[in-house]
Interface confidence: low
């Protein structure tokens, strides 16, 4: 899986979309998890409604929401009031039994609030994974990924 970069501004909301083949994943619940370490497990943050037919209903866990358009094949995650500690590597997953298939690997990056006049020297925060040769930016705010920059886990 290539990694897709989504960038958001601290304090604002960030919407992450994960497209998938609706037929291949028919009847499956979805989840959003955070990668713990470069090779660590993916810790569940939030999952869609227990009843697959109600997957369109938005479910929240803290400041993170998930909703699934099962016909169109798009899982949408909203990170509300984005904070630096939200930066890191995540996965959109399709669940079947005790197994989970990765739909998309997502790198969330948090940009400093341009109206925050504190030192804005280090705008980039935790967590790359996989090769970034093919990573692409899905948000209107973009940056070029440093050549050769290697996977690291979220830090705190």
């Amino acid at each position: 899986h290539n990694t897709t970069v989504f960038q958001g501004v601290a304090g604002q909301s960030l919407q992450v979309s994960c497209p998938y083949d609706s037929m291949a994943h028919w009847g499956r619940r979805k989840a959003w998890c955070r990668q713990l370490g470069e090779k660590g497990p993916c810790q569940r943050v939030v999952s869609t409604h227990n009843l697959w037919l109600l997957s369109f209903l938005r479910r929240w866990n803290g400041s993170t929401a998930i909703t699934d358009d099962t016909l169109g094949g798009t899982l949408t995650i909203t990170l509300r009031n984005l904070q630096p500690h939200d930066a890191g590597l995540y996965q959109c997953q399709s669940l079947h039994g005790s197994e989970a298939d990765t739909l998309r690997k997502v790198l969330v990056e948090v940009l400093a609030d341009p109206l925050d006049h504190r030192d804005a020297g280090d705008l980039w925060f935790p967590g790359e994974s996989e090769s970034f040769e093919d990573a692409h930016v899905e948000h209107s705010i973009s940056r070029s990924l440093l050549e050769g920059e290697i996977p690291f886990p979220p830090t705190s």
């Epitope: 090779k39 990056e109 925060f125 050769g148 690291f152």
Partner: antibody
Framework: QVQLQQSGPELVKPGASLKISCKAS????????MNWVKQRPGKGLEWIGR????????NYNGEFRVRATLTADTSSTTAYMQLSSLTSEDSAVYFC????????????????WGQGASVTVSS | DVVMTQTPLSLPVSLGDQASISCRSS???????????LHWYLQKPGQSPKLLIY???NRFSGVPDRFSGSGSGTDFTLKISRVEADDLGVYFC?????????FGGGTKLEIK
């Protein structure tokens, strides 16, 4: 305690292949990157690549990508480096070295090194 | 690739003196996660390299506090406050911010 025990010295002919082993003990082998580093006599250190034994994931230094193959056997906690089409330029000491990881903010430094495997390529 | 340049090549010191080794990288070593993956190793004759300092300024376990690392971005320094006979050898800086990992050419610390 962490130990990396490498195979012994080798004398090989030009054009031949060679497989060096690195037996790890004293830590969770599967979940730590293993690096391989080359040092020619009187020279500096050159990174060849790394392997994550847990899933076989590898990264290589471009110039070694064609001739070096990194593998790992989790059952015997041993990492291997195979070098093919050897030339005199490959005469060197080869080290295996574990990547130190201390979450959060993992260090990604090589904290434990094998004793080195000396390779001489000569006809 | 990131090129690491160490100076001086050779550093003659008297025991008890302070020694300072410089390491410069061709690109910034600040990773996008905010950390700087610059490390220092010591290789004594006939031995494997040993980790001294990781991530610019963190002493590895068992390393005396006479050793200290500093710097940021592209310029880094290793200082040995009071050189002892056991400190002699070749010092290498290394970066692991980007693949391929790269090493400096080494600085040989020797008795004056």
């Amino acid at each position: 305690q962490v130990q990396l025990q490498q195979s012994g010295p080798e004398l090989v002919k030009p054009g031949a292949s060679l497989k060096i082993s690195c037996k790890a003990s004293g830590y969770a082998f599967s979940s730590s990157w293993m690096n391989w580093v080359k040092q020619r006599p009187g020279k500096g250190l050159e990174w060849i690549g790394r392997i994550y034994p847990g899933d076989g994931d590898t990264n290589y230094n471009g110039e070694f990508r064609v001739r070096a193959t990194l593998t790992a056997d989790t059952s015997s906690t041993t990492a291997y480096m195979q070098l093919s089409s050897l030339t005199s330029e490959d005469s060197a000491v080869y080290f295996c070295a574990r990547l130190l990881r201390n979450q959060p903010g993992e260090s990604y430094a090589m904290d434990y090194w094998g004793q080195g495997a000396s390779v001489t390529v000569s006809s | 690739d990131v090129v690491m340049t160490q100076t001086p090549l050779s550093l003659p010191v008297s025991l008890g003196d302070q020694a300072s080794i410089s390491c410069r990288s061709s690109q910034s070593l600040v990773h996008s996660n905010g950390y700087t993956y610059l490390h220092w190793y010591l290789q004594k004759p006939g031995q494997s390299p040993k980790l001294l300092i990781y991530k610019v300024s963190n002493r590895f376990s068992g390393v005396p506090d006479r050793f200290s690392g500093s710097g940021s971005g592209t310029d880094f320094t290793l200082k040995i406050s009071r050189v002892e006979a056991d400190d002699l050898g070749v010092y290498f800086c290394s970066q692991s911010t980007r693949v391929p990992y790269t090493f400096g050419g080494g600085t040989k610390l020797e008795i004056k």
